[in-house]
């Protein structure tokens, strides 16, 4: 015997209590799928949370981070600091990236300059607290004559700056 | 972590009335569908009703006796209970949960519980 419950639309519950009859689901609520039992409590965008998309009877609000933050953990349950470019956030707030490290972005950690001896190749371009290193060729492939730039002096390998 | 306590429960005569209320702690009632269940002696868990922006959802027993109502500002729920009856004798729990009605969920969280006893 089919359950009467399957003939209600996403957007209402079934109601136990009045014969499985479908009544909508109240504002600020919201049913995905048919045949549901309950609706759903609505996600609220409330502080460092904005509404990204309004809740609906079938679906639920989608949240952002306001300026200065962004989204962390799915469907953006948290809100983390942004920093600048060259920093990274900790316990204490924005640092600066120490000596031989770098970050490109507003967020994440600040993580070591390539080593550009490793894949034996030279420092094109010196890192920043904001950049990597760019490597260029190889010493052996700037042979004599080939061209005219004279190598950067390497960069310091990563480390510490003094405090 | 929330708390919910319940209050407003005790002795009242046939036909009477009872205001339960039930404060939340630790976390605003705004974000929940809030309500009640009630236990007699000897008896299963029984729901008695659910309270979601601005709409009440009732048990099937209660006959328009019962009224759940909140205070978002107080962080509180009220359940009114008029003609009380001798079958309405129950420990009366408030509840809250991300789902409404709560007539066929167990709730996120839920109080203590207050005694009340309808007898003359």
């Known amino acids: 015997l089919q359950d009467p419950c399957s003939n209600c639309p996403a957007g209402t519950f079934c109601d136990n209590n009045r014969n499985q009859i479908c009544s909508p689901c109240p504002p600020n609520s919201f049913s995905s799928a048919g045949g549901q039992r309950t609706c759903d409590i609505c996600r609220q965008c409330k502080g460092v949370f904005r509404t990204r998309k309004e809740c609906s009877s079938t679906s639920n609000a989608e949240c952002d981070c306001t300026p200065g933050f962004h989204c962390l953990g799915a469907g953006c349950s948290m809100c983390e600091q942004d920093c600048k470019q060259g920093q990274e956030l900790t316990k204490k707030g924005c640092k600066d990236c120490c000596f031989g490290t770098f970050n490109d972005q507003k967020r994440g950690i600040c993580r070591p300059w390539t080593n550009c001896s490793l894949d034996g190749k030279s420092v094109l371009v010196n890192g920043t607290k904001e950049r990597d290193v760019v490597c260029g060729p190889s010493p052996a492939d700037l042979s004599p004559g080939a061209s005219s730039v004279t190598p950067p002096a390497p960069a310091r390998e990563p480390g510490h700056s003094p405090q | 972590e929330v708390q919910l306590l319940e209050s407003g429960g005790g002795l009242v005569q046939p036909g009477g009335s009872l205001r339960l209320s039930c404060a939340a702690s630790g976390r605003t009632f705004d974000n929940y569908a809030v309500g009640w269940f009630r236990q007699a002696p000897g008896k299963e868990r029984q729901y008695v009703g659910t309270y979601w922006s601005g709409y009440a959802h009732y048990g099937d027993f209660e006959n328009n006796r019962f009224t759940i109502s909140r205070d978002n500002s107080k962080n509180t729920l009220y359940l009114q209970m008029n003609s009380l009856r001798a079958e309405d004798t129950a420990v009366y729990y408030c509840?809250?949960?991300?789902?409404?009605?709560?007539?066929?969920?167990?709730?996120?969280?839920q109080g203590q519980g207050t005694l009340v006893t309808v007898s003359s």
């Open positions: 509840a809250i949960s991300l789902k409404y009605p709560m007539a066929t969920v167990t709730p996120d969280y």
